[in-house]
């Protein structure tokens, strides 16, 4: 959402979020690190191209032309400088001048040593308990953001991990149309459209960066879960990793796992949609998870096959009209899981990413809640690894990522909601090792892959 320094009456009224970096001679004297040439405070560039007609409520949602409903001036950083005040480096760069390259390695969770697994689990738990040092979240829409008295900004602190959950919730929530009116649900700024992969890529990159800073460990990387095993068991659901099944309640996590102590945020949908409030930092019930346990839907009781990944990587067009969840021959819709692994759209199909979520059969299978289950992180790093392999194979061909007429939030140049500072889909449509400072240690199955009997 927004930096703590910008959650003030003055900043919100002025529309300017350009915090100081090192103000030597008082507030406002080093906006965006301007005194050291790192950046400048400039007008926000927001995509104004038309979106598809399925969203008919222009003017009613704070996420439109993001982030202009809140701020119209922000830091534009020079060179490899980055961040809300140009005080950090772009992903993949380090040093005082952000001129030295770094590359971190995302590895299979199951390949980590005992110590590394333990470190990852502890780090996630620390992120759940540690207040985000930079961002605060809005608990009201823009028209009520200054509170009943017009002088009390409606923002809250939130933990690093819950911020990760909140940003996802905010991107998928319904459009509130007023008290007594049904909220509009045919909107999603991070799924069912071309931005699905780029949005989730930045989402993970932000969490990874936040955890690196929390740990003071620049090499810290998010591992992945290779969910394409074709099995009906969750191989990472053990107490040394993401938590086994509780013996007392098959929908809960074992008390031997730290994740059994986690409590979810953003579960009060009824309130948000009827009162027009937003999810806040209040934690609620436990994570629910029942892998392969949805007996009413046998098709989601088994994970994707290894060859499903090989097949989806042969779909050469990034996306196809109508750039939605019914696109055929679209790599994005295939990996998202609304098409079968060959790219053919079928309304009954749930494959790859979607199937992995639904297989978890609980918190991780509900869009507005799913990041509350930390398996979400590992599921999406694997999805991102598939995306990165596609970018490598097809030379990051962005030509079929639409500039306009995609679902709202999904145009190529749209600033991804609700990330700060503003970041477009285009910026994430690049090969990660060369442009974003991370790589995957992974072997891709070939088409002929078969499981020996």
């Amino acid at each position: 959402q927004f930096p703590r320094q910008c959650a003030t009456v003055e900043a919100l009224r002025s529309g300017m979020c350009c915090p100081d970096l090192s103000p030597v001679s008082g507030p406002g004297t080093d906006r965006c690190g301007s005194s050291s040439g790192r950046g400048r405070c400039e007008a926000v560039t927001a995509d104004s191209r038309p979106h598809s007609p399925q969203y008919p409520h222009d003017g009613r949602d704070d996420r439109e032309v993001w982030p202009l409903r809140f701020f119209n001036r922000t830091c534009h950083c020079n060179g490899n400088f980055s961040g809300h005040n140009c005080g950090t480096c772009r992903p993949g760069w380090r040093g005082a001048a952000c001129d030295q390259r770094v590359l971190i390695v995302r590895r299979n969770l199951l390949d980590l040593s005992k110590e590394e697994k333990n470190h990852f689990v502890r780090a996630l738990d620390m992120a759940k308990r540690t207040t985000h040092p930079l961002f605060v979240i809005a608990t009201r829409r823009s028209e009520e953001i200054l509170g009943p008295d017009g002088n009390t900004p409606q923002f809250e602190n939130i933990s690093i991990y819950n911020y990760f959950v909140w940003t996802h919730y905010y991107s998928v929530k319904k459009t509130f149309l007023g008290v007594g009116q049904e909220s509009f649900g045919e909107v999603d700024f991070s799924h069912e459209g071309p931005a699905f992969l780029t949005w989730h890529r930045y989402h993970l990159l932000r969490l990874e960066k936040d955890m690196q800073e929390m740990l003071q460990e620049p090499s810290f990387s998010l591992p992945y879960w290779n969910f394409a095993t074709g099995k009906n068991v969750c191989d990472i659901c053990t107490d040394d990793l993401m938590g086994s099944r509780s013996n007392f309640d098959s929908t809960l996590i074992s008390p031997n796992s730290v994740f059994s102590q986690w409590r979810v945020v953003c579960d009060s949908l009824e309130d948000y949609d009827t009162l027009g409030t937003l999810c806040n930092s209040t934690e609620d019930g436990p994570i629910r998870r029942n892998p392969a346990g949805n007996v009413a839907r046998p098709m989601v009781q088994r994970l994707p096959e290894p060859q499903d990944v090989a097949q989806c990587l042969e779909v050469g067009l990034f996306d196809t009209p109508p750039f939605y969840s019914n696109s055929t021959n679209s790599f994005r819709n295939t990996v998202e899981g609304y098409s079968d692994p060959t790219g053919k759209y079928d309304p009954a199909v749930r494959s790859l990413h979607n199937l992995a979520h639904l297989f978890l059969n609980g918190t991780g299978g509900q869009t507005h809640l799913s990041p509350n289950d930390p398996i979400f992180v590992l599921l999406h790093t694997f999805t991102d690894a598939v995306f990165d392999e596609w970018l490598r194979r097809y030379n990051a061909d962005i030509s079929t990522f639409p500039l306009e007429n995609a679902p709202i939030g999904h145009n190529r140049q749209y600033n991804m909601v609700p990330f700060w500072p503003p970041v477009t889909n285009t910026e994430m449509f690049v090969t990660a090792p060369d442009n974003l400072g991370y790589t995957y240690e992974i072997q891709w199955p070939s088409r002929e892959f078969s499981v020996p009997e």
Epitope: T88, A96, L103, E213, P218, S219
Partner: antibody, heavy 121, light 107 residues
Framework: EVQLQQSGAELVRPGALVKLSCKTS????????LHWVRQRPDQGLEWIGW????????VYDPKFQGTASLTADTSSNTVYLQLSGLTSEDTAVYFC??????????????WGQGASVIVFS | AIQMSQSPASLSASVGETVTITCRAS??????LAWYQQKQGKSPHLLVY???TLADGVPSRFSGSGSGTQYSLKISSLQTEDSGNYYC?????????FGSGTKLEIK
């Protein structure tokens, strides 16, 4: 002027527990990570772990996990290292030191004078 | 965990000479490296951070270099006060291990 003032020498029995303090001045400990380092007699430096006094988060080298415990009192700008289950192997000088919160800067820039712990039977 | 191999374990040189101490990391540490000097009975003292940036007040005869897994500390025009132990430390991944140290003696 930045200073880290450590508590005095400790003579302790095997199996006992000791708590060393490090009182800082000249900076706000909430803005820095405080690290601890061990040096056995005529040996090199061993990194123990860090504490972020702003939120109490701690990280330890796995070999010190369970025996070392770091805490902080921001009201008095003091950090503590507690060592339990002491053996003769823990006879050493223990240093507190600080690192800039900006994790990009790779350095422990100011150090305490060290506190000697002698485990004797 | 990253291991830091420091060499030589000890060396002896005369005033005015140049010496080089090296540290090899077991993996790429991307310049997340510091060098410290420790005199007998004293606390370590920061010389170099980010592999090559001299800390405030450190004489220019000290210089750090290197990248990837190989790093060096060079001391030119040796002075008598340069005797002591020298340590490297990485900050790339936890735990932040030190090199085993180099004892420098001035003849």
């Amino acid at each position: 002027e930045v200073q880290l003032q450590q508590s005095g020498a400790e003579l302790v029995r095997p199996g006992a527990l000791v708590k060393l303090s490090c009182k800082t001045s000249g900076f706000n400990i909430k803005d820095y990570f405080l690290h601890w380092v061990r040096q056995r007699p005529d040996q090199g430096l061993e990194w123990i772990g860090w504490i972020n006094p702003d939120n109490g988060n701690t990280v330890y080298d796995p070999k010190f996990q369970g025996t070392a415990s770091l805490t902080a009192d921001t009201s008095s700008n003091t950090v503590y290292l507690q060592l339990s289950g002491l053996t003769s192997e823990d006879t050493a000088v223990y240093f507190c030191t600080r690192r800039d919160y900006t994790y990009e800067k790779a350095a422990l820039d100011y150090w305490g004078q060290g506190a000697s712990v002698i485990v004797f039977s | 965990a990253i291991q830091m191999s420091q060499s030589p374990a000890s060396l002896s040189a005369s005033v005015g000479e140049t010496v080089t101490i090296t540290c090899r990391a077991s993996g790429n540490i991307y310049n997340y490296l510091a060098w410290y000097q420790q005199k007998q009975g004293k606390s370590p003292h920061l010389l170099v951070y980010d592999a090559k940036t001299l800390a405030d007040g450190v004489p220019s005869r000290f210089s750090g270099s290197g990248s990837g897994t190989q790093y060096s500390l060079k001391i030119s025009s040796l002075q008598t006060e340069d005797s002591g132990n020298y340590y490297c430390q990485h900050f790339w991944s936890l735990p932040f291990t030190f090199g085993s140290g180099t004892k420098l003696e001035i003849k």
